[in-house]
């Protein structure tokens, strides 16, 4: 093949080599960029900056080599458009530092930085950690900091990510309240901070205030949906990023739903209960407290991490006709009570009998003196027969 006269020449099926002295000062408009998996650049003393726009359109790039060139600065977001990058060789350039953000999100198997006039400061703590942990082939390079000594010897006691403290209200929060959260950020070299509120959606109206080192967040007119939702404060410095998540508990009264019994391995009377704080529960059967046993018991499904509602079953193991009847679930928390009832028929009565005859079942009555049709409204002093904390 004839020698290639261009600044950059094809190499293999999806590679490009740019080795003609001083031919490049940026990586804009490389030929066939979108299909490149390998890019080799050498002897480009005018190539001093590598920025986000330089690698746009190089989405397939796996290997990038820029060596013996004039590279002085690599932007923190330079490799945003090259998520598949696995080998990065920037040896023998003029790099004094490289931000942790530059390699964040990449799965680099190899990172070569030897031959650069690196300058040791907390900004290279991440690289020192790579060296300590044997990542990316860094230990073999025995990196030196210009004028100082081996990167491995850099003191790092003061090289911490920011420390965050989020203050949440102590008092109970009710639906409709406004809540002020404050995130206190401490640490050296603070660069950026903010809130992540992606989980909130319609849970409240959000107003941000303040800035480093004290960020304010007002959640106005909160709804019960705010429960179990993460409100996250984050901050970054030259060492790395820290995040702290908190949840605001919004009090609301108990609610309950019952569904038609379904036959599974055991029979199940499905229910859903909600409330903050988590309500205590008790079951009634035909108006009397149902004492749970190994044959009839409450079972909860695994709760969803981001909601207060709990789903479960009243499990009945091989119920017979004596278990046919009216099932009521009572739920109560300090902010209110609720109940729901359902008729369940598991099996026809195999015996002929007079419907007026009593059925011998060992249930204790709830309140023999009460004639109230709605047990939820009763102000009886009887303790719940079954108390289950939900949440």
């Amino acid at each position: 093949a004839a020698p290639c006269p261009d600044a950059c020449c094809p190499h293999g099926s999806s590679g490009l080599r740019c080795t003609r002295d001083g031919a490049l000062d940026s990586l804009h408009h490389l030929p066939g960029a979108e299909n490149l998996t390998e890019l080799y650049i050498e002897n480009q003393q005018h190539l001093q900056h590598l920025e986000l726009r330089d690698l746009r359109g190089l989405g397939e790039l796996r290997n990038l080599t820029i060596v013996k060139s004039g590279l002085r600065f690599v932007a923190p977001d330079a490799f945003h458009f090259t998520p598949r990058l696995s080998r990065l060789n920037l040896s023998f350039n003029a790099l004094e530092s490289l931000s942790w953000k530059t390699v964040q999100g990449l799965s680099l198997q190899e990172l070569v930085l030897s031959g650069n006039p690196l300058h040791c400061s907390c900004a290279l703590r991440w690289l020192q950690r790579w060296e300590e942990e044997g990542l990316g082939g860094v230990p073999e390079q025995k990196l030196q900091c210009h004028g100082q000594g081996p990167l491995a010897h850099m003191p790092n006691a003061s090289c911490g990510v920011p420390t965050l403290k989020v203050q949440v209200p102590n008092a109970s929060v009710d639906v409709g309240d406004d809540v002020l959260l404050r995130c206190q950020v401490e640490g050296r070299g603070l660069e950026q901070a903010g809130w992540i509120l992606t989980e909130l959606e319609q849970s409240a109206t959000v107003m941000k205030s303040g800035g480093l080192p004290s960020l304010g967040l007002t959640l106005a007119n909160v709804t019960s949906d705010l429960n179990r939702k993460n409100v996250t404060c984050w901050a970054e410095n030259d060492v790395g990023r820290a995040e702290v998540s908190v949840q605001v508990n919004v009090s609301f009264p108990a609610s309950v739903q019952l569904h038609t019994a379904v036959e599974m391995h055991h029979w199940c009377i499905p229910f859903s209960v909600d409330g903050q704080p988590a309500p205590s529960l008790r079951w009634l059967f035909n108006g009397s407290v149902l004492n749970e046993t190994s044959f009839i018991f409450t079972e909860f499904l695994e709760p969803a991490a981001n909601e207060t509602v709990r789903h479960g079953c009243l499990r009945l193991n091989q119920p017979t006709h004596v278990n046919n009847g009216n099932y009521t679930l009572l739920a109560a928390n300090p902010f209110g009570q609720a109940s729901a009832s359902i008729m369940a028929a598991f099996m026809d009565n195999p015996f002929e009998f007079n419907p007026e005859d009593p059925i011998p079942v060992s249930f204790s009555p709830v309140d023999t003196n009460s004639t109230s049709g709605d047990p939820v409204e009763k102000k009886d002093e009887t303790p719940f027969g079954v108390s289950v904390a939900v949440g």
Epitope: E96, P117, H119, S121, C122, A123, Q144, H146, G147, Q148, G149, P150, H153, M154, P155, A157, S158, C159, R188, G189, L190
Partner: antibody, heavy 119, light 106 residues
Framework: QVQLVQSGAEVKKPGASVKVSCKAS????????MHWVRQAPGQGLEWIGT????????SFAQKFQGRVTLTRDTSTSTAYMELSSLRSEDTAVYYC????????????WGQGTTVTVSS | DIQMTQSPSSLSASVGDRVTITCRAS?????LYWFQQKPGKAPKPLIY???TLGSGVPSRFSGSGSGTDYTLTISSLQPEDFATYYC?????????FGGGTKVEIK
């Protein structure tokens, strides 16, 4: 013990050059970066540049770029700082100092060399 | 370059006094160094990376601080402590020194 011994005082005319030596003893000369710092009369300390005797890598303060040359002779464990195109404001005491990476600081200093630039 | 500003530039104190010298960096730095210099002598390292005493430095000297604000404290001034004190950063090139604080006998 670790010692840095510098050459004697110099008087130079403006436009001339001066070469100050710094002889190291008591440690492996090629392992530690050697720095040069100066102090004008009654003034503070000013960093000039550094050399790694192991491979002659150098760095300089922008202010001295092109006017200062740092060299070393590993056979005699001596570092040299040459400053050219001297001006009166280069009158100062010039120090060599070792950067001790085990504890990460300038631990040993030469006694200083007074350079006077006067017509 | 990162500027280092020392205050005060000079102070008069008596033997036994507690003396505090501050050093402020123009931007956040990783760690700080302090040197003591007596007339006609080379600087002597006093404190390295912010709070660690150099070898042979008496415990009456202490360093603290983070970010941009740092302090050198002499808990009980002794006759041999009358000197000029310099702070120095090396968070980024070039290393820079403060203007110095001269501690004189009252």
């Amino acid at each position: 013990q670790v010692q840095l011994v510098q050459s004697g005082a110099e008087v130079k005319k403006p436009g001339a050059s001066v070469k100050v030596s710094c002889k190291a003893s008591g440690y492996t000369f090629t392992t530690y970066w050697m720095h040069w710092v100066r102090q004008a009369p009654g003034q503070g300390l000013e960093w000039i540049g550094t050399i790694y005797p192991g491979n002659s890598d150098t760095s300089f303060a922008q202010k001295f770029q092109g006017r200062v040359t740092l060299t070393r002779d590993t056979s005699t464990s001596t570092a040299y700082m040459e400053l050219s195109s001297l001006r009166s404001e280069d009158t100062a005491v010039y120090y060599c100092t070792r950067f001790y990476f085990e504890d990460w600081y300038f631990d040993v200093w030469g006694q200083g060399t007074t350079v006077t630039v006067s017509s | 370059d990162i500027q280092m500003t020392q205050s005060p530039s000079s102070l008069s104190a008596s033997v036994g006094d507690r003396v505090t010298i501050t050093c402020r960096a123009s931007s956040s730095i990783s760690w700080l160094y302090w040197f003591q210099q007596k007339p006609g002598k080379a600087p002597k390292p006093l404190i390295y990376y912010t709070s660690t005493l150099g070898s042979g430095v008496p415990s009456r000297f202490s360093g603290s601080g983070s970010g941009t604000d740092y302090t050198l404290t002499i808990s009980s001034l002794q006759p041999e402590d009358f000197a000029t004190y310099y702070c120095q950063q090396w968070h980024s090139y070039p290393p820079t020194f403060g203007g110095g604080t001269k501690v004189e006998i009252k």
